[in-house]
Interface confidence: low
Amino acid sequence: QHTCSISKVTSLLEVNCENKKLTALPADLPADTGILHLGENQLGTFSTASLVHFTHLTYLYLDRCELTSLQTNGKLIKLENLDLSHNNLKSLPSLGWALPALTTLDVSFNKLGSLSPGVLDGLSQLQELYLQNNDLKSLPPGLLLPTTKLKKLNLANNKLRELPSGLLDGLEDLDTLYLQRNWLRTIPKGFFGTLLLPFVFLHANSWYCDCEILYFRHWLQENANNVYLWKQGVDVKDTTPNVASVRCANLDNAPVYSYPGKGCPTSSGDTDYDDYDDIPDVPATRTEVKFSTNTKVHTTHWSLLAAAPSTSQDSQMISLPPTHKPTKKQSTFIHTQSPGFTTLPETMESNPTFYSLKLNTVLIPSPTTLEPTSTQATPEPNIQPMLTTSTLTTPEHSTTPVPTTTILTTPEHSTIPVPTTAILTTPKPSTIPVPTTATLTTLEPSTTPVPTTATLTTPEPSTTLVPTTATLTTPEHSTTPVPTTATLTTPEHSTTPVPTTATLTTPEPSTTLTNLVSTISPVLTTTLTTPESTPIETILEQFFTTELTLLPTLESTTTIIPEQNSFLNLPEVALVSSDTSESSPFLNSDFCCFLP
């Protein structure tokens, strides 16, 4: 009887020999095998010579086979896709002679320490190369010269300290480049050449911002909409650009794209561009203008964007340099913890965590003139903060409207830290309709750079903070008042703060409630008029750091009872990446915390 299962659902005969405790290739494979799955066996070594008679073989899967050596001593003329991922390969043989038709090569999650210069020679058809999660410390010059058709290159999660300057030369078809989570300090001048790369991942490296970074800085500014923060399980096309995810390891994690480069030479001889200092900073936000004729209300969509730390080997956690000494900050938040998850000590300091807030707000034409909500005392240049106060929860398996009040100001060219006091729990991201009252004033929605420093002056705001009482109820526990701080405004756009009471109901008593308090103070500015004009949609994306201090916890999951009738849609709430999963054990991919 045949060891493997056989099917022919396509024009190729597919043979599945996965997890059969094989130590060698089965002797009775069909001669016309086109797709061969050998994953999860104990092959140890593998030779392509064993497959030369399978002249239709197009896809070969050798993942998780405990491979320590691969011999390419047999030519597989038709093989297009080779999966060698999750093995123990420390080196790769020359592949081109044996696999001339190869279009996809996956050698991720191995132990490759280096690559020989000609390892890819002859792979003229290669379109996708996956080398992530290896031990690569450097790459040989000319490595990719033979692979002129390459479209996707993944070098993430290695130990690359530098890149050969001509690595991408001739790769005109390249559209996706993963370089996140390496030890890169800079990018060689001219590295990207004239390539147009729609999707580039560069975060979690040790970018060193000095005069040598200016080429890279300029490239980031020119390609701000093509730089992304990698998020596990999410297709790159479904994520939002985040150029601010590329940060200076030596400058308190300020974004590289906004590095001032003061005192650096600007002659074209030193760079691949003419004069860096003449280039204005690129905004950290992007604006999409959509025309509408029938929208009657403000609609605000919130979501936290981040890659959650998890036990996955490729969870994208921002790696901070060991020399980084961030300013201590505190935040208040409520966190949902699942049963069996690590219990936290009463007080704990985490590494700085980067948060990205995406605010998608549709402005509706209105003649209303909004009065200023506060003034800025001794303003820092070019810093116009935004106040956001929200109470949100997302209990598992429920769709719960939540009252929310929001005041936003977005002056031209402003740098907007987003201080927020919020209550939010969400074990699983879901779409939750939430009541809201929102006031948004926008002068130039298209320009909102992220601050390079988090230094803010804190004036006496005219908007008064008022206490909010929240009653927490659980089926099996006593009622416990939970103090929170909120800045609320009335639905009529007045700036008068009002006290609010929200009832918190807990369907499951299996979670942990944690308070964190932020010291970043809100500052509001500017009287703005929203004239009668075409509605526009503005997407603001902020990326900033905070350090968390955990306070005593309560076991509970919270649910807010709706009190208003307009709705805030919460399509996605995911956890933000932190330095390591160990440093913030309460941050898990299934959990969510709000800002800041």
């Epitope: 002249t55 390419t72 003329i77 043989p93 020359s94 002679w97 044996a98 038709a101 002859g122 058809q125």
Partner: antibody, heavy 118, light 113 residues
């Protein structure tokens, strides 16, 4: 220009061994895959062995385990070690350069005759 | 192994004639991904080494006169000499370089009529 010169052929008894050499010049030897192709008297061509630029050997079943192809890039020389020779191994042995990872042969030597006879 | 069969095994022709040699493979030599047929043609004169004429069915090796052309796809291939010249009298071999072991046809001898 590209030149391939074979040597080492001769008459040998069945079961004995012989080593052929091929001296290459006029191109960057280390960058090319090389092969041996033979032609029995009055017969057609038969591929015998190939070796990649990285040194990986490859054989047809007819010689597998008896013949060994190797190369010395420092000497620009290709070798074919032939053991357990049989009468049917009698042929002119050509050294040939393989083009660009595709196994067709763009340059050939003049050949060396190996006669296996008792 | 892929068997290669040439026809005719020999032919007589005169200078200026159009000569056609066919080669059949026991299985397709077409790589559907790149649409290339992995077939080469060689010319061999008595006492000499073979000389590459054509590879990938129709790509002429540099220095080969344009009167030599190749065509075909899948399992049926043709070498055409549009106007036979005195130096073209030789034996011609086809070779598949699609799947190992690389195999040759038995040869077609082109003689003077």
């Amino acid at each position: 220009q590209v030149q391939l010169v074979e040597s080492g052929g001769g008459v040998v008894q069945p079961g004995r061994s012989l080593r052929l050499s091929c001296a290459a010049s006029g191109f960057t030897f280390s960058s090319f895959a090389m092969s041996w192709v033979r032609q029995a008297p009055g017969k057609g061509l038969e591929w015998v062995a190939s070796i990649t630029s990285a040194g990986t050997p490859y054989y047809p079943d007819s010689v597998l385990g008896r013949f060994t192809i190797s190369r010395d890039n420092s000497k620009n020389t290709l070798y074919l070690q032939m053991n357990s020779l049989r009468a049917e191994d009698t042929a002119v042995y050509y050294c040939a350069r393989s083009r660009g990872y595709e196994d067709y042969f763009d340059y050939w030597g003049q050949g060396t005759l190996v006669t296996v006879s008792s | 192994d892929i068997q290669m069969t040439q026809s005719p095994s020999s032919l007589s022709a005169s200078v200026g004639d159009r000569v056609t040699i066919t080669c059949k493979s026991s299985q397709s030599l077409l790589n559907s991904r790149n649409q290339k047929n992995y077939l080469a043609w060689y010319q061999q004169k008595p006492g000499k080494a073979p000389k590459l004429l054509i590879y990938f069915t129709s790509t002429r090796e540099s220095g080969v006169p344009s009167r030599f052309s190749g065509s075909g796809s899948g399992t049926d291939f043709t070498l055409t000499i549009s106007s036979l010249q005195p130096e073209d009298f030789a034996t011609y071999y086809c070779q598949q370089h699609y799947s190992s072991p690389w195999t040759f046809g038995q040869g077609t001898k082109v003689e003077i009529k």
